[in-house]
């Protein structure tokens, strides 16, 4: 691990309460596909525990959806990736709405360092899937 | 070769059979930009030759699509990456439908073992287009 | 560096004139949390200073977009990465139109050699986002 | 607090139509759905349709062709419209809250209830 | 469409005893990692009251002693101990597509 090849791939657990717009993720091998080898989660939301550049990416599809689910709800639906906290880093850095499609996938490099907790915001009142295969997040450090 | 940087990026050769919804996958530097370096081709199909996590991307563009093609097609068009060999590991890993776009993308993280072959799977009745630069699917080995 | 670590992502600076397609990119600290540490940039271009096996991503979100934006407007708009100097290794390296969505995002693992500029064209008339976690465009050194 | 009030009449002549106004407080109709509901002795609860935030709207199919869903979001309320009754359109008809999530399609506030009689 | 069978029709429970109803769908209403199935309770002259969602998710301010199992086409609601209040009439639904479909119903009576 001395390395830094920390990288970490998670599942969704569950959504938050109604005014808490992040999703919950859980990780580890008993889950499926899923695991932590650095990072770690804090109450479902992902912490870095080592300086450097991640690449980190997301995909997630909404539940039991069809291109017409995301244009029968008023509000826009909107996945967004950012640092939550320390508060003084806290910054968005990846975003996308579904519009007439039902899954939102991208990757960005960013640098992040230790202490960083990433949270995803999914606004709207579409609930994801959690399905494995549909619904992910993932960190993966690429350099110092 | 002994870093285990296995790499492959695919480019499609053909679609199967009526009843076989599987791409078939082609690479190499005679071909364009597509290339071989540790994992192999059977049939078509992606072998992989060393454990590890590695991530898996993919782009399938449908050909002379238009973002009505889609909603024309009554069954939806989805697509499917999964380790389809050796069937005691079969699972769907990423999982994606076209609703009204032309394009699908995406990446993750996952762990792969020496052998495992991974099948993409294309349902519905549409052709996906050929051009290199629309349709590729390809592995990077990340760390042990 | 010696290890060959290249790596970049930029941040939208501008769109070209009316009849460039090209989309202007920068990086750096001061800007956000954009870099280029290896690669360097040419009147706005990603040029390349190290041979291997790149993964290039991008994301490209149109701005004040919602899903009847993009179906208004009877050219379709298509982003397009490609490598577009030295003339004689000019190719599209990865294609995407936008359809009726806002955003699209994908990534490719490529072979690149010191000295290739990429460029990313996006036709079409509407104009990208400049949001820096809407709209951004990355390569990455994986491999010799 | 969140209600539905129903207001509409009880008794309908057969092949005449069925106006309900739903009247709701405690949430706004630019964020929530509204279902209705029909409940009758002999066919239990039946969904008969429902309209978004948006104002799209979705129809049980068996009752498509005379049911129509409105609504005011300025004054909050729900308007409900069958056309054609019959006898066994006899039930209580109940407009209902589709809950926070919009693909969950669960109803977790109901309207009072309006018993509807078709007879001559 | 989908069809859900309750089974019992009625059934009567002595106080603190242990109340179980089933619902059967007609085919799986488990999808994108949940299960579609939810129960409400009605009483006389009252509309339906929600219970659990997405087959084990107690509504907010319903008693702790109701719970709800199941997935794929089985779906069970428990009602332990159960309570004088608790003697209703208990209703599944689905939500896995459209037409939405509820159960005819269980009677739950106290002995």
């Known amino acids: 691990e001395s390395l830094g090849w920390d990288i970490a791939e998670l599942q969704l657990n569950h959504t938050g309460p109604q005014q808490d717009p992040r999703l919950y993720w859980q990780g580890g091998p008993a889950l499926g596909r899923s695991f932590l080898r650095g990072p770690e989660l804090d109450k479902g939301q992902l912490r870095i525990r080592r300086d450097g550049i991640y690449m980190v990416h997301i995909q997630v599809t909404l539940a039991i959806c069809s291109s017409t689910s995301t244009s029968r709800h008023h509000h826009p639906t909107t996945l967004a990736v950012g640092i939550c906290s320390p508060a003084s880093r806290s910054i968005s850095l990846l975003r996308l709405s579904f519009h007439q499609g039902c899954t939102i996938a991208s990757q960005r490099l960013t640098p992040l360092a230790r202490g960083d907790t990433l949270c995803t915001n999914l606004t709207g009142t579409l609930l994801p899937s959690r399905n494995t295969d549909e619904t992910f997040f993932g960190v993966q450090w690429v350099r110092p | 070769e002994s870093l285990g940087w296995d790499i492959a990026e695919l480019q499609l050769n053909h679609t199967g059979p009526q009843q076989d919804p599987r791409l078939y996958w082609q690479g190499g530097p005679a071909l364009g930009r597509s290339f071989l370096r540790g994992p192999e081709l059977d049939k078509g199909q992606l072998r992989i030759r060393r454990d590890g996590i590695y991530m898996v991307h993919i782009q399938v563009t449908l050909a002379i699509c238009s973002s009505t093609s889609t909603s024309r097609h009554h069954h939806p068009t989805t697509l499917a990456v999964g380790i389809c060999s050796p069937a005691s590991r079969s699972i769907s890993l990423l999982r994606l439908s076209f609703h009204q776009g032309c394009t699908i993308a995406s990446q993750r993280l996952t762990p792969l073992a020496r052998g495992d072959t991974l099948c993409t799977n294309l349902t519905g009745t549409l052709l996906p287009s050929r051009n290199t630069d629309e349709t590729f699917f390809g592995v990077q080995w990340v760390r042990p | 560096e010696s290890l060959g670590w290249d790596i970049a992502e930029l941040q939208l600076n501008h769109t070209g004139p009316q009849q460039d397609p090209r989309l202007y990119w920068q990086g750096g600290p001061a800007l956000g949390r954009s870099f280029l540490r290896g690669p360097e940039l040419d009147k706005g271009q990603l040029r390349i200073r190290r041979d291997g096996i790149y993964m290039v991503h991008i994301q490209v979100t149109l701005a004040i977009c919602s899903s009847t934006s993009t179906s208004r407007h009877h050219h379709p708009t298509t982003l397009a990465v490609g490598i577009c100097s030295p003339a004689s290794r000019s190719i599209s390296l990865l294609r995407l139109s936008f359809h009726q969505g806002c955003t699209i995002a994908s990534q490719r693992l490529t072979p690149l050699a010191r000295g290739d500029t990429l460029c990313t064209n996006l036709t079409g008339t509407l104009l990208p986002s400049r949001n820096t976690d809407e709209t951004f465009f990355g390569v990455q050194w994986v491999r010799p | 607090e969140v209600q539905l009030k129903q207001s509409g009449p009880g008794l309908v002549q057969p092949s005449q139509s069925l106006s309900i106004t739903c009247t709701v407080s405690?949430?706004?109709?630019?964020?929530?759905?509204v279902h209705w509901v029909r409940q009758s002795p002999g066919k239990g609860l039946e969904w008969l349709g429902v309209?978004?935030?948006?104002?799209?709207?979705d129809y049980n199919a068996a009752f498509i062709s005379r049911l129509s869903i409105s609504k005011d979001n300025s004054k909050s309320q729900v308007f409900f419209k069958m056309n054609s009754l019959q006898a066994d359109d006899t039930a209580i008809y109940y407009c209902?809250?589709?809950?926070?999530?919009?693909?969950?399609?669960?109803?977790?506030?109901w309207g009072q209830g309006t018993s509807v009689t078709v007879s001559s | 469409d989908i069809v859900l069978t309750q089974s019992p029709a009625s059934l009567a429970v002595s106080l603190g005893q242990r109340a179980t109803i089933s619902c059967r769908a007609s085919?799986?209403?488990?999808?994108?990692?949940?299960?579609?199935m939810h129960w409400y309770q009605q009483k006389p002259g009252q509309p339906p009251k929600l219970l659990i969602y997405?087959?084990?998710n107690l509504e907010s301010g319903v008693p702790a002693r109701f719970s709800g199992s199941g997935s794929g086409t089985d779906f069970t609601l428990n009602i332990h101990p159960v309570e004088e209040e608790d003697a209703a009439t208990y209703y599944c639904?689905?939500?896995?597509?459209?037409?939405?479909?509820f159960g005819a119903g269980t009677k739950l009576e106290l002995k």
């Open positions: 997405l087959a084990s």
């Open positions: 309209i978004w935030s948006t104002g799209i709207t």
């Open positions: 639904q689905h939500s896995r597509e459209l037409p939405l479909t």
């Open positions: 085919k799986s209403v488990s999808a994108s990692g949940y299960n579609f």
């Open positions: 209902a809250r589709n809950s926070y999530y919009g693909n969950l399609y669960v109803m977790d506030y």
């Open positions: 405690g949430f706004s109709l630019t964020t929530y759905g």
